[in-house]
């Protein structure tokens, strides 16, 4: 929102030119050399002011005429020293010099702030020859001035390896204030003071600042730019802007929203990505962050079994990547899961709870009290065991896997048997006599095969030996038993 309140016309006298062809006359110059074509605005400041000595660089020509009279020193005529105008207006200014006709190939170049102006500038040099001298006028025009056109302009002419430099013409482009620093959007703690900064420049100076909060002026009198506003604290969102005023009018900064940090909204869309027997991978969509970055999240897990003690397991994790694998869960169990996240202000409420279940797992323990007998009469090995505790079955038992390895005289052979879940005994036929049979048993669920029991060894003698006693799972700490019957 930019408005220009007023435009001040600053009159500049147009001095009469000293010779024909001055741009204030209607004479047509004999020769016109345009450096660049372009619209030439009507506004014109006279290039000359006769009768004053020049203070810039002066070239004293060494050449004399036929009559051996020394030539006068060469210098640019005085011109207007300072032009003040509004942005987007047109301006034209010039340098003029009278050069004796003995000099050929004189060119005038324009310089701004120490740099030569080349290329598509609207510069025109006009020549007005007379009997002894040629008047040269170099005009420079800008059709629509901008702030970047501010600066010191000079003309330079080279004669006899001497450089003649004009007095500077200062161009001052005035306009509405221009912001160099505007207030920035911020997220702030409730009821906590904070600062906003506003800075604007002219010309013209001074630039005065008014602060506006929710369309009400904070300061009824202006403050010089730059201005820092200390806001004493907010309880709700507010919009701030600053107005910059100078003699040309006012410019209004962008409005910035200042938000109040709050606790986050609860996460939404908690979903199950994957379930295993002992872990559940969940994801969630974070809620609104309350204008303060999330720091971390907390996953709350409670057993959904009505007979459970209702204790809640809490897992803390980083806020990203909105994904967490909950571990150390029981197999084939139901859980309620909720997620809460925190920022610097505090914790969000818990998300809506979701129900999740772990899958069946392979049993986590082996069958207990494994005992092996040799039944010589039927040429079988009888195996007995106790099923693992229900808690550690990690699913519904579908049976058992029995591994029996027969070893004799350097030959080893492993066989596997599957047994239904009902029994807790099995019978396998003797494979080799005069050999050691090593038996291990694992419980099986749909989730897989559990660990095998510790090995139980029994020696199978040659035919005709007597079956004395069973072999059984050793007590903890004992070496592998070998029972020879």
């Amino acid at each position: 929102a930019i408005t220009e309140a007023r435009e001040e016309a600053k009159p500049y006298p147009l001095f009469p030119g000293p010779f024909p062809g001055s741009l204030q006359t209607d004479h047509t110059p004999l020769l016109s050399l345009p450096h660049a074509s372009g619209y030439q605005p009507a506004l014109m400041f006279s290039p000359t002011q006769p009768g004053r000595p020049h203070t810039g660089n002066v070239a004293i020509p060494q050449v004399t005429s036929v009559e051996s009279k020394p030539l006068p020193p060469l210098a640019f005529k005085h011109t207007v020293g300072h032009i003040i105008l509004s942005e987007h207006k047109g301006v034209k200014f010039n340098c003029s010099i009278s050069v004796p006709n003995i000099y050929q190939d004189t060119t005038i170049s324009w310089w701004k702030d120490g740099k030569e102006l080349l290329g598509a500038h609207h510069a025109i040099t006009q020549f007005y020859p007379d009997d002894e001298v040629t008047a040269i006028i170099a005009s420079f025009s800008i059709t629509s001035v901008q702030r970047s056109d501010n600066g010191s302009y000079i003309c330079k002419m080279k004669i006899n390896n001497e450089e003649i430099v004009s007095d500077p013409i200062y161009i001052e482009v005035q306009g509405l204030p221009h912001f160099t620093k505007q207030p920035e959007s911020m997220n702030v703690t409730r009821n906590t003071a904070f600062n906003l900064t506003c800075q604007a420049v002219g010309p013209p100076e001074p630039v005065n600042i008014f602060w506006v909060q929710n369309s009400s002026r904070v300061n009824e009198q202006p403050e010089k730019s730059p201005s820092v506003l200390t806001v004493p604290g907010l309880t709700e969102m507010a919009v701030f802007s600053c107005e910059a005023h100078n003699d040309k009018g006012l410019t209004v900064s962008k409005g910035v929203q200042i938000n109040i940090k709050a606790i986050p909204s609860p996460p939404t869309e908690v979903s199950i990505r994957n379930s295993t027997a002992h872990s559940i991978l969940i994801s969630w969509v974070p809620g609104f962050d309350g204008y303060s970055p999330f720091r971390n999240c907390s996953i709350q897990v409670k057993e959904a079994d009505p007979l459970s003690n209702g204790s809640v397991m809490i897992f803390n994790t980083s806020a990203l990547p909105h994904l967490y694998q909950i571990k150390q869960l029981q197999a084939l169990a139901n859980y309620s899961i909720g997620v809460s996240c925190m920022n610097e202000i505090g914790w969000s409420a818990v998300s809506p709870w979701i129900l999740a279940s772990t899958t069946e797992g392979a049993p986590s323990v082996a069958p207990l009290n494994v005992t092996v007998f040799l039944n010589e009469s039927s040429d079988n090995v009888d195996i007995r065991w106790m099923k693992p505790p229900t808690k550690q079955q990690d699913g519904e038992l579908v049976g058992y896997r029995i591994s029996h390895v027969w070893q004799s005289a350097g030959i080893s052979k492993e066989l596997l048997e599957e047994v239904g879940q009902n029994g807790s005994r099995a019978r396998i036929s003797v494979q080799v006599h005069n050999a050691t049979c090593t038996v291990r048993i694992a419980a099986v669920t749909r989730g897989g095969v559990g660990p095998f029991s510790d090995p139980v060894k029994i020696f199978i003698p040659a035919h005709g030996w007597v079956d004395y006693a069973p072999s059984s799972t050793p007590a903890p700490g004992n070496a592998d038993p070998v029972l020879i019957i």
Partner: antibody, heavy 118, light 106 residues
Framework: QIQLVQSGSELKKPGASVKVSCKAS????????MNWVRQAPGQGLEWMGW????????TYADDFKGRFVFSLDTSVSTAYLQISSLKAEDTAVYFC???????????WGQGTLVTVSS | EIVLTQSPDFQSVTPKEKVTITCRAS?????MHWYQQKPDQSPKPWIY???NLASGVPSRFSGSGSGTDFTLTINSLEAEDAATYFC?????????FGQGTKLEIK
């Protein structure tokens, strides 16, 4: 330190005029606006308006348009309140107070009692 | 214009008691200022912009509120707190004051 010193009590007849002064010191006078606040005997505070000490432009609350005039003499850092055609109900203590950010009246004059009585 | 209504108008309180003065605005305001005035004195700035204590104000005072409801609280009243307290709103012209709450020590 910042001080606002007001002129002394005035006893006036109905129809007369009075001019109350408020001299500021301890800060740049033209940096802060000057408010005028009225307090009738035993009553609350009424904001009368303010004068921009930078531009000299006054702003009057609706109830104080007409007979009340705010003015300045920046050369002596003084604000003035003039009341013309005084009425009995103008009897009150008149305070000047600086106009800070958010219309915070951080500094107050000691008050000037104007009594209008025939 | 925004009308500010303070309650109570008058309160007689024993020392060490907690005191709450409320100021209700007829429509939402951005900030509420509070001033303390003792008899035959000018008002003193007391609480700036809802909750900021002016310099020299004891910490037993506090201010809070937003929108239309604002409060000045004295945690443990002392004899020197006997005075009239005025609220003043910022946010809408004209500036307005509450009618005042007079605190008396029993």
């Amino acid at each position: 330190q910042i001080q606002l010193v007001q002129s002394g009590s005035e006893l006036k007849k109905p129809g007369a005029s009075v001019k109350v002064s408020c001299k500021a010191s301890g800060y740049t006078f033209t940096n802060y606006g000057m408010n005028w606040v009225r307090q009738a005997p035993g009553q609350g505070l009424e904001w009368m308006g303010w004068i921009n000490t930078y531009t000299g432009e006054p702003t009057y609350a609706d109830d104080f348009k007409g007979r009340f005039v705010f003015s300045l003499d920046t050369s002596v850092s003084t604000a003035y309140l003039q009341i013309s055609s005084l009425k009995a109900e103008d009897t009150a203590v008149y305070f000047c107070a600086t106009y800070g950010h958010y219309a915070w009246f951080a500094y107050w004059g000691q008050g000037t009692l104007v009594t209008v009585s025939s | 214009e925004i009308v500010l209504t303070q309650s109570p108008d008058f309160q007689s309180v024993t020392p060490k008691e907690k005191v709450t003065i409320t100021c209700r605005a007829s429509s939402s305001v951005s900030y509420m200022h509070w001033y303390q005035q003792k008899p035959d004195q000018s008002p003193k700035p007391w609480i700036y912009a809802t909750s900021n204590l002016a310099s020299g104000v004891p910490s037993r005072f506090s201010g809070s509120g937003s929108g239309t409801d604002f409060t000045l609280t004295i945690n443990s009243l002392e004899a020197e707190d006997a005075a009239t307290y005025f609220c003043q709103q910022w946010g809408t012209k004209p500036l307005t004051f509450g009618q005042g709450t007079k605190l008396e020590i029993k």
